[in-house]
């Protein structure tokens, strides 16, 4: 058993049929010695008396808020949560496996630039009685500070019969140099509590590997005289690291109709303009990627050909 | 501005071109190592990230873009000093900081070159003959060093009398390639920045 936060404790259980469970001793936080009784949750049934209560925790029915009282007055609470371990593996029931970029990916993180700010998100089908707490650091043995905000519900989607909820959190490395060469990864730890179930999820990454620039901005078209060719120009996104001559981007320019299966014109360039062939009912799209370290491409910025 | 290959700038451009070749060569070599050594811990997640130039050179600090010198987190240690002549320098007006930066890059390349050559000598003794260093990568390191053209003491190639542990050598190769790729990215960024300014 260990303390998650004040008056909240996590009991780690090997989860299999007829498992013996864990013996837990609860101590009432009071100077009083006599006349103390214990109850669980909203029940008025007295579970025991005395300053300490010994319980055998085997299942979710044994978890919950234990309260010690004296003469109708509440003295203190202890909330017990369960963390299940099945076949030596901690349970991952609360969050959905996003399977990208690989299986067992529960947390996904992205950074728009090298400033040390990044966003992580996760998915769940659970809508109520759900809380998250996020901690982060650079390195684990001698951790350096990363400050994370509160996790918030950022999107709701309908997937078949199920509703899916996306939560996200923003974090900022306390003293980040955009030009630094990372040797220690960022560690992100998410504590998830659903009702009386506790789970924790972790992710480890270098900022350079989670870079995904914002789409290029200010796309403009200039038809070339006596030609089907069009000069398309754009600018670096505002959120990209500066100076741009140091943090350079490379671009992919594509002309395509509405369907992915349609024919297309595609060209890659390090410049902020390109010449392409425009077709009726097609769109010109441009996306960006770090020129020197190939992490993710940005989303497309698009303008219609006409 | 876009510099045509036919008439390269007499200043930074040769170094920019060589640094692009360097990044390409080390990325290819790292990819090859990952594929060939698939049963060794050779991915970014599996290896320890070591920097053989740590406390010996200060390329990131010495080559910091002016715009980032206002960022206190970037200014931890900017006290290393180096030789100040080099053929990549665009003009006599070249600042002391730029000379310091380029000589730091030269020192990095020299250290990695020695490490890679020593390692290759060991790998050539491996009866499995599983992996060797790409001669193109070694040539590209050499070309960039020549383009930088700094006078510097030659570092003797390390020779070891004991029987090499090929497993450890291959893991060290992965560590070295990962670190060198990151440094090659920095070098490319620096050359691009200097070329633009």
């Amino acid at each position: 058993i260990w303390e998650l936060k004040k008056d909240v404790y996590v009991v780690e259980l090997d989860w299999y049929p007829d498992a013996p469970g864990e013996m837990v001793v609860l101590t009432c936080d009071t100077p009083e010695e006599d006349g103390i009784t214990w109850t669980l949750d909203q029940s008025s049934e007295v579970l025991g008396s005395g300053k300490t209560l010994t319980i055998q925790v085997k299942e979710f029915g044994d978890a919950g808020q234990y309260t010690c009282h004296k003469g109708g007055e509440v003295l203190s609470h202890s909330l017990l949560l369960l963390h299940k371990k099945e076949d030596g593996i901690w349970s991952t029931d609360i969050l959905k496996d996003q399977k990208e970029p690989k299986n067992k990916t529960f947390l996904r993180c992205e950074a728009k630039n090298y400033s040390g700010r990044f966003t992580c998100w996760w998915l769940t089908t659970i809508s109520t009685d759900l809380t998250f707490s996020v901690k982060s650091s650079r390195g684990s043995s001698d951790p350096q500070g990363v400050t994370c905000g509160a996790a918030t519900l950022s999107a709701e989607r309908v997937r078949g019969d199920n509703k899916e909820y996306e939560y996200s959190v923003e974090c900022q490395e306390d003293s980040a140099c955009p030009a630094a060469e990372e040797s220690l990864p960022i560690e992100v730890m998410v504590d998830a509590v659903h009702k009386l179930k506790y789970e924790n999820y972790t992710s480890s990454f270098f900022i350079r590997d989670i870079i995904k620039p914002d789409p290029p901005k200010n796309l403009q078209l200039k038809p070339l005289k006596n030609s089907r060719q069009v000069e398309v120009s754009w600018e670096y996104p505002d959120t990209w690291s500066t100076p741009h001559s140091y943090f350079s981007l490379t671009f992919c320019v594509q002309v395509q109709g509405k369907s992915k299966r349609e024919k297309k014109d595609r060209v890659f360039t390090d410049k902020t303009s390109a010449t392409v062939i425009c077709r009726k009912n097609a769109s010109i799209s441009v996306r960006a990627q770090d020129r020197y370290y190939s992490s993710s491409w940005s989303e497309w910025a698009s303008v219609p050909c006409s | 501005r876009n510099l045509p290959v036919a008439t390269p700038d007499p200043g930074m451009f040769p170094c920019l071109h060589h640094s692009q070749n360097l990044l390409r060569a080390v990325s290819n070599m790292l990819q090859k190592a990952r594929q060939t050594l698939e049963f060794y811990p050779c991915t970014s997640e599996e290896i320890d990230h070591e920097d053989i130039t740590k406390d010996k050179t200060s390329t990131v600090e010495a080559c910091l873009p002016l715009e980032l010198t206002k960022n206190e987190s970037c200014l931890n240690s900017r006290e290393t000093s180096f030789i100040t002549n080099g053929s990549c320098l665009a003009s006599r007006k070249t600042s002391f900081m730029m000379a310091l930066c380029l000589s730091s890059i030269y020192e990095d390349l020299k250290m990695y070159q020695v490490e890679f050559k020593t390692m290759n000598a060991k790998l050539l003794m491996d009866p499995k003959r599983q992996i060797f260093l790409d001669q193109n990568m070694l040539a590209v390191i050499d070309e960039l060093m020549q383009a930088l053209n700094f006078n510097s003491e030659t570092v003797p190639q390390k020779s070891s009398l004991e029987e090499p542990d090929f497993y450890k050598t291959k893991i060290k190769l992965c560590i070295l390639l990962h670190a060198f790729r990151i440094r090659a990215v920095t070098i490319d960024r620096v050359m691009s920045y200097l070329n633009a300014s």
């Epitope: 299966r261 024919k263 062939i277 | 876009n2």
Partner: antibody, heavy 118, light 107 residues
Framework: QVQLVQSGAEVKKPGSSVKVSCKAS????????LHWVRQAPGQGLEWMGW????????EYAPKFQGRVTITADESTSTAYMELSSLRSEDTAVYYC???????????IGQGTLVTVSS | DIVMTQSPLSLPVTPGEPASISCRAS??????LHWYQQKPGQAPRQLIA???QSISGVPSRFSGSGSGTDFTLTISSLQPEDFATYYC?????????FGQGTKVEIK
């Protein structure tokens, strides 16, 4: 299986014209760009131009501008390349090629040898 | 027009050995570079798209690298069927242009 089948070899006199055909099978004809590339005996490849069969848009290499005409007939899934004012240096194997991507080729026809000789 | 220069023009290789062909562009073309193989009396066949993207059905011994002005086609271990002429082609701008070809011959 996508295929491009070209018309047979031709022998032409200098100053005349030649029209080579390229019939596509497998896949929708108008879903692809069609190019013509030629190769003189013992020489390298030379791009001549492309057509978008969907709308008849074309683009020609400046070297052939005014002398080459590329057309397409959607009803027969056939593209044509006509080269006029032939000279001996036009003796080459002419290939048609296609792709959903405009600027390179994933399927190339078997080639048609055009010999220009007096 | 962008001029593509291949080297060497002829490359004698022992079967089973690796081979590398270089292609240089007269100006920067990013990764807009494609490789083709042509055997005598046959049409060219696509090997690599956009400098390094492998094409389905092409053996994994063929790989491409490069960006900007310098590109390489590498055959990791030459098989008897790989003896052919190889062409690079730029798609950065029209007119599309090819290298003059590299003939890989049996040593």
């Amino acid at each position: 299986q996508v295929q491009l089948v070209q018309s047979g070899a031709e022998v032409k006199k200098p100053g005349s014209s030649v029209k080579v055909s390229c019939k596509a099978s497998g896949g929708t004809f108008s879903d692809y760009y069609l190019h013509w590339v030629r190769q003189a005996p013992g020489q390298g490849l030379e791009w001549m131009g492309w057509i978008d069969p969907e709308n008849g848009d074309t683009e020609y290499a400046p070297k052939f501008q005014g002398r080459v005409t590329i057309t397409a007939d959607e009803s027969t899934s056939t593209a044509y390349m006509e080269l006029s004012s032939l000279r001996s240096e036009d003796t080459a194997v002419y290939y048609c090629a296609r792709n959903k991507e405009l600027r390179y080729f994933d399927v190339i026809g078997q080639g048609t040898l055009v010999t220009v000789s007096s | 027009d962008i001029v593509m220069t291949q080297s060497p023009l002829s490359l004698p290789v022992t079967p089973g050995e690796p081979a590398s062909i270089s292609c240089r562009a007269s100006q920067s073309i990013s990764i807009n570079l494609h490789w083709y193989q042509q055997k005598p009396g046959q049409a060219p066949r696509q090997l690599i798209a956009f400098a390094s993207q492998s094409i389905s059905g092409v053996p994994s011994r063929f790989s491409g690298s490069g960006s900007g002005t310098d590109f390489t086609l590498t055959i990791s271990s030459l098989q008897p069927e790989d003896f052919a002429t190889y062409y690079c082609q730029q798609s950065n701008s029209f007119p599309l242009t090819f290298g003059q070809g590299t003939k890989v011959e049996i040593k």
